[in-house]
């Protein structure tokens, strides 16, 4: 049962407190723990912030850090959707140059099939 439901940080919560925000989320939402100094409060989000992806788990869905090298945003633990500036996206990974047989599309920073 959500308490403090009028508090905007309790949106989408199954369980919420004034001090720590959400501690559990509604089924389709993702838990994200915002840390500020030595304090923290939980949020329930429809989509995870940049640099995180939505990890589904039996106990609770949560946002998890994208750990693909040189990746800014990812769809899952091992599939990048947007690389850091200066890197090209190819099959969910980030490269400083496109592999042989692929050319960089500068506007999207993706590697596409074709000659250079």
């Amino acid at each position: 049962r959500a308490s403090y439901v009028s508090n905007p940080i309790c949106k989408g919560c199954l369980s919420c407190s004034k001090d720590n925000g959400c501690s559990r989320c509604q089924q389709k939402l993702f838990f994200f723990l915002r840390r500020e100094g030595m304090r923290q409060y939980g949020e329930c989000l429809h989509s995870c912030p940049s640099g995180y992806y939505g990890h589904r788990a039996p106990d609770m869905n949560r946002c998890a850090r994208c750990r693909i090298e040189n990746c800014d945003s990812c769809f899952s633990k091992d599939f990048c959707t947007k690389c850091k500036v200066g890197f090209y996206l190819h099959r969910g990974r980030c490269f400083d140059e496109c592999p042989d047989g692929f050319a960089p599309l500068e506007e999207t920073m993706e590697c596409v099939e074709g000659c250079e």
Epitope: S15, S23, F31, M38, M60, R67
Partner: antibody
Framework: EVKLVESGGGLVKPGGSLKFSCAAS????????MSWVRQTPEKRLEWVAS???????YYPDSVKGRFTISRDNVRNILYLQMSSLRSEDTAMYFC???????????????????WGQGTSVTVSS | DIVMTQSHKFMSTSVGDRVSITCKAS??????VAWYQQKPGQSPKLLIY???TRHTGVPDRFTNSGSGTDYTLTISSVQAEDLALYYC?????????FGGGTKLEIK
Amino acid sequence: EVKLVESGGGLVKPGGSLKFSCAASGFSFSSYAMSWVRQTPEKRLEWVASISSGGSTYYPDSVKGRFTISRDNVRNILYLQMSSLRSEDTAMYFCARGGDPGVYNGDYEDAMDYWGQGTSVTVSS
Amino acid sequence: DIVMTQSHKFMSTSVGDRVSITCKASQDVSSAVAWYQQKPGQSPKLLIYWASTRHTGVPDRFTNSGSGTDYTLTISSVQAEDLALYYCQQHYSTPWTFGGGTKLEIK
């Protein structure tokens, strides 16, 4: 292979100081938060300090002002400087990867995923 | 500070048995719970984090269930090498705190 090797423990008198280190290898040291955890003679585990990849430091009240955690990202070494030592600081001190209180990861780095073999500290007169 | 309580200091079991080690937090920790195994003469090793995710290389006989304040580490079929101390830890808010440990003994 992730490897953490502590050194520099020993016997010290109450009120004394000690600095020990943890040499890290097998991973990108500068990208990870690092922590110190101690195990008392009664086998209780207590968090001692954490340092973020960016150098922000965190301590529990029991050691704040007495212990200092630091890191050398060039030599891949984590340090713990302890001063004003008390008998209750007697423990095995482990360095561990992870445990950054300033950042939410949602994965293994929120816990402490690799630990060194530990270095023993005895505070006694 | 959040207090993590492991009610059993010792548990005795036989090879092949199913065993459950419990841990209770003094407040809701949003599944931010890790479990560590410490074998005699060794340092602790991470088994599980975020309540249900097994760390790299951890056998699937180790599982955790629970949410809110109550968490349970289950070993579905105990092996002789599982003789160890087991600790829970909350990684929800600082100071990070650990349970007192449960020593698993093999009959």
